[in-house]
């Protein structure tokens, strides 16, 4: 049961990570304009995202503008866009692989194949987490570098936006969930208790093993 619990926890974490990643990529809050010093009353805040930028007036009114030309965009923004989309697609692929190998599905009957699929999905989720982490960390690095660069004028200085924090959370959840899925798969390949297969097999006895019969070394 511990293996199944870890699998469920792993996939729940990766799903949360995927949703977080989607929101992070979509929200125009990667960079927030930093108006600093001289006791200025700022009438507006500028948010910049991967797809659009928004101006929020002091009245609360928000105007957003989608970036016009893909080719006119800075290369780092294009790369961040691409990595974000790839990360989300990779995570979806990981989910499909997991579903194929999950203990409660009949897509694959053989236990070893199931274990391999779950392990593969875990690795795919970890890759997705790393892909999510790259644009987020790259953008954060650029923001911090410019913020403390004495050559950069204030209008060009930015602060870390909420999307970056969501991105870090997404990456962490995908890495953690993927890691858990990898851990649920024993190195030997024999995947835990057989009673998970019982409901799909007419000849299988409807008797489950006692707890002492589990190969506990696989659940450390």
């Amino acid at each position: 049961m511990a293996s199944a619990g870890m699998q469920i926890l792993g996939v729940v974490l990766t799903l949360l990570g995927w949703v977080n990643g989607l929101v992070s990529c979509a929200l125009p809050m990667w960079k927030v304009t930093a108006f600093i010093g001289n006791s200025i009353v700022v009438a507006q805040v500028v948010w910049e995202g991967l797809w659009m930028s928004c101006v929020v007036q002091s009245t609360g009114q928000m105007q957003c503008k989608v970036y016009d030309s893909l080719l006119a965009l800075p290369q780092d923004l294009q790369a961040a866009r691409a990595l974000c989309v790839i990360a989300l697609l990779v995570a979806l692929f990981g989910l499909l692989v997991y579903l194929a190998g999950a203990k409660c599905t009949t897509c694959v009957e053989e236990k070893d194949s199931k274990a391999r699929l779950v392990l593969t999905s875990g690795i795919v989720f970890v890759i997705s987490g790393v892909l999510t982490l790259i644009p987020v960390c790259w953008t954060a690095h650029a923001i911090i570098r410019d913020f403390y660069n004495p050559l950069v004028a204030e209008a060009q200085k930015r602060e870390l936006g909420a999307s970056l924090y969501l991105g870090w959370a997404a990456s962490g959840l995908l890495l953690l969930g993927g890691g858990l899925l990898c851990c649920t798969c024993p190195s030997g390949g024999s995947q835990g208790p057989s009673h998970y297969m019982a409901r799909y097999s007419t000849s299988a006895p409807a008797i489950s093993r006692g707890p002492s019969e589990y190969p506990t070394k696989n659940y450390v």
């Epitope: 004495p150 050559l151 004028a153 204030e154 209008a155």
Partner: antibody, heavy 120, light 107 residues
């Protein structure tokens, strides 16, 4: 007292390059970023770019990007500005000017200027 | 780029009279404005930063005001040594840009 001593006047042919130096003294070199501003005869001032002497990071005016290179020799407390592919409209007085590292981007002290004449 | 427009181009004022120079930015520069004085044959000298803050050693007859896009340099009582070209410079946004200059002369 603070001094920004620039190299002498230069006459160059179109297409050539010029390298102007700015030797500083009287203050801690790394506490100020060094910038270059030019002034064509009878014209206004035009910022070209600047350098952080601590790490060599540069920031250029897009107008000069690719043609201007600003460098520093920290040990000699000297800044350099090289402008390539010179044309007649580059004839100007080139000033080095410093900006306090932890301050805002205005120039609190200027060099005496170097006249660069581009003529065939 | 932020354009800085100075007016007038030149100004002739009697000794002891007030001289007013205007500087208009193409967008809000949030008081990130400096004023420089360049006397004939000399290098620019910083007079005012932050739109209103007088630099050390600058006579109190010089003052700066304004906000948003519009800024003003005032010489309350013009002296002979104030004959110069005055430049405004915004440092809100890169590239740093200067106004076209205002030449102040004695009438």
């Amino acid at each position: 007292q603070v001094q920004l001593v620039q190299s002498g006047a230069e006459v160059k042919k179109p297409g050539a390059s010029v390298k102007v130096s700015c030797k500083t003294s009287g203050y801690t070199f790394t506490e100020y970023t060094m910038h270059w501003v030019r002034q064509a005869p009878g014209q206004s001032l035009e910022w070209m770019g600047g350098i952080d002497p601590n790490n060599g990071n540069t920031h250029y005016n897009q107008k000069f990007q690719g043609r201007v290179t600003i460098t520093v020799d920290k040990s000699a407390s000297t800044a350099y500005m090289e402008l390539s592919s010179l044309r007649s409209e580059d004839t100007a007085v080139y000033y080095c000017a410093r900006i306090y590292y932890f301050g805002r981007l205005y120039f609190d002290f200027w060099g005496a200027g170097t006249l660069v004449t581009v003529s065939s | 780029d932020i354009q800085m427009t100075q007016s007038p181009d030149s100004l002739a004022v009697s000794l002891g009279e007030r001289a007013t120079i205007n500087c208009k930015a193409s967008e809000d520069i949030y008081n990130r404005l400096a004023w420089y004085q360049q006397k004939p044959g000399q290098v620019p000298k910083l007079l005012i930063s932050g739109a209103t803050s007088l630099e050390t050693g600058v006579p109190s007859r010089f003052s700066g005001s304004g906000s948003g896009k519009d800024y003003t340099l005032t010489i309350s009582s013009l002296q002979a040594e104030d004959v110069a070209v005055y430049y405004c410079q915004q440092y809100w946004s890169s590239p740093l840009t200067f106004g076209g200059g205002t030449k102040v002369e004695i009438k």
